[in-house]
């Protein structure tokens, strides 16, 4: 498990506001389900909680996961549940609430400072500011100029979709935004989060090529609804 | 075609320091993250470092955090790992990759022995 | 920390389809659905096989196809060929740590 703690990778070297909001409706990229990088600052309330029935966590907001409504009931019948404050006992990341993660069964708080940078990117389309600055460093964080005389190909960086050449679009991938394939058929995507939460997550997809959607995959029979595959199918 | 050359492996006594250098070649050196990654004799990989493509972010394994330094000089196309307070543990075939989705290019490797 | 477990040998006879196998957690490869597959032959740099679950890079054979299920991913050859004999690698990240991880390594045999 994720019992690690966050260490001097995490403080001292998150990947730069690299710009472009990416992961919103309508945009080429989709964001891997699972572990959001910390953010967000709504916490759902029981007052406006309305049940909605999910498979896996992804069909759920930001501030929800997936789960049997009773402890240690049908796993058939499964509802989106606001999500754990912290402090709170966790079986996995996506139970606990934006800005903090699951350690050793607790939801504990991810240090948000820390991760501005990563809030901001969502934020903002264009560099609002070319130096981040973290624990005292002021570092440049444009891109190299040639990324404007060519087009970026496979796995360089980029900013927004139009930096990549074409078939390809700028998405997230783990530390930095860079140009990915759009999708064939069969492979994996990902299914957008209700409420258009899908911002902040640290693998990107592109979007399903032309004739294609994302569903969950046929045959594809497991023990843990949570983690269910989607993939690129022919309408 | 991508070329990726380490070079700067060697013996090294415990405690010494040792600069790995790898060139690149075949595609545009400054639009893409690199990444270092070492193998053990009869052992498995680990990743030990990765640097962006304009040097504004570098991470490290906690094994070699604080003792090792990425960095790069893109008008030369040139990767670097610098190597500090080696130990017996760092021996191992080191390798240069480039990180575009995920590990796509490998070099050869060089080869650093920390023994006394 | 996030290990990834795979099994230390798999075998198989030329012309079978053969599967290795790489578990992590619901916190890992259960939970954000990344994982890719590293070929090593002997004394030779690793290669990249397939990337993000089922996605093969350009060059390498439709002999190699990847799939995850829960919290394991694997790796299937089919149609074995003495050249597929290798060391075969999973890897995925950690988000806590900023860092890439691999799992121990499968060595292929090929009967």
């Known amino acids: 498990t994720l019992n690690s703690v966050l260490n001097s990778n995490a403080i001292k070297n998150l990947p730069p506001p690299l710009g472009g909001a990416a992961g919103h409706p309508g945009s080429a990229v989709s964001a891997a389900p699972g572990i959001l990088y910390p953010g967000g600052n709504k916490y759902q309330t029981i007052d406006n909680y309305q049940p909605y029935p999910c498979a896996e966590d992804e069909e759920c907001g930001t501030d929800e996961y997936c789960a049997s409504p009773t402890r240690g009931g049908d796993a058939g019948v499964q509802i989106c549940l606001a999500c754990r404050k912290r402090r709170k006992r966790c079986m996995r990341h996506a139970m606990c609430c934006p800005g903090n993660y699951c350690k050793n069964g607790i939801c504990v708080s991810s240090d948000q400072n820390h991760f501005r940078g990563e809030i901001e990117e969502t934020i903002t389309e264009s560099f609002g500011n070319d130096h981040s600055t973290l624990d005292g460093y002021s570092r440049r964080t444009t891109l190299s100029s040639k990324m404007y005389h060519t087009k970026g190909q496979e796995g360089s960086v980029c900013l927004r979709s139009s930096d990549c050449a074409s078939g390809l679009c700028c998405a997230r991938h783990f530390w930095s935004k860079i140009c990915k394939p759009v999708l064939k058929e069969g492979q994996v995507c990902t299914k957008h989060r209700r409420k258009g939460s899908h911002g902040l997550e640290i693998f990107q997809r592109c979007y399903c090529g032309e004739g294609l959607s994302c569903r969950i995959q046929k045959d594809h029979h497991q023990a843990s609804n949570s983690s269910r595959l989607h993939t690129c199918q022919r309408h | 075609q991508v070329q990726l050359v380490e070079s700067g492996g060697g013996l090294v006594q415990p405690g010494g320091s040792l600069r790995l250098s790898c060139a690149a070649s075949?595609?545009?050196?400054?639009?893409?993250?690199m990444s270092w990654v070492r193998q053990a004799p009869g052992k498995g990989l680990e990743w030990v470092s990765v640097?962006?493509?304009?040097?504004?972010?570098?991470y490290y394994a906690d094994s070699v955090k604080g003792r090792f330094t990425i960095s790069r000089d893109n008008s030369k196309n040139t990767l670097y790992l610098q190597m500090n307070s080696l130990r017996a543990e760092d021996t191992a075939v080191y390798y240069c990759a480039r990180h575009g989705i995920d590990f796509d290019h490998w070099g050869q490797g060089t080869l650093v022995t920390v023994s006394s | 920390d996030i290990a990834l477990t795979q099994p230390a040998s798999v075998s198989g006879s030329p012309g079978q389809s053969i599967t290795i196998s790489c578990t992590g957690t619901?916190?890992?490869?259960?939970?954000?659905?990344?994982v890719s597959w590293y070929q090593q032959h002997p004394g030779k740099a690793p290669k990249l096989m397939i990337y993000?679950?089922?996605n093969r890079p350009s060059g390498v054979s439709n002999r190699f196809s990847g799939s995850k299920s829960g919290n394991t991913a694997s790796l299937t050859i089919s149609g074995l060929q003495a050249e597929d004999e290798a060391d075969y690698y999973c890897q995925t990240y950690d988000q806590i740590k900023l860092s890439a991880v691999f799992g121990g390594g499968t060595k292929l045999t090929v009967l």
């Open positions: 075949g595609f545009t050196f400054s639009s893409y993250w």
């Open positions: 619901s916190s890992d490869l259960g939970g954000y659905n990344y």
């Open positions: 993000d679950v089922n």
């Open positions: 640097i962006s493509s304009d040097s504004s972010s570098t």
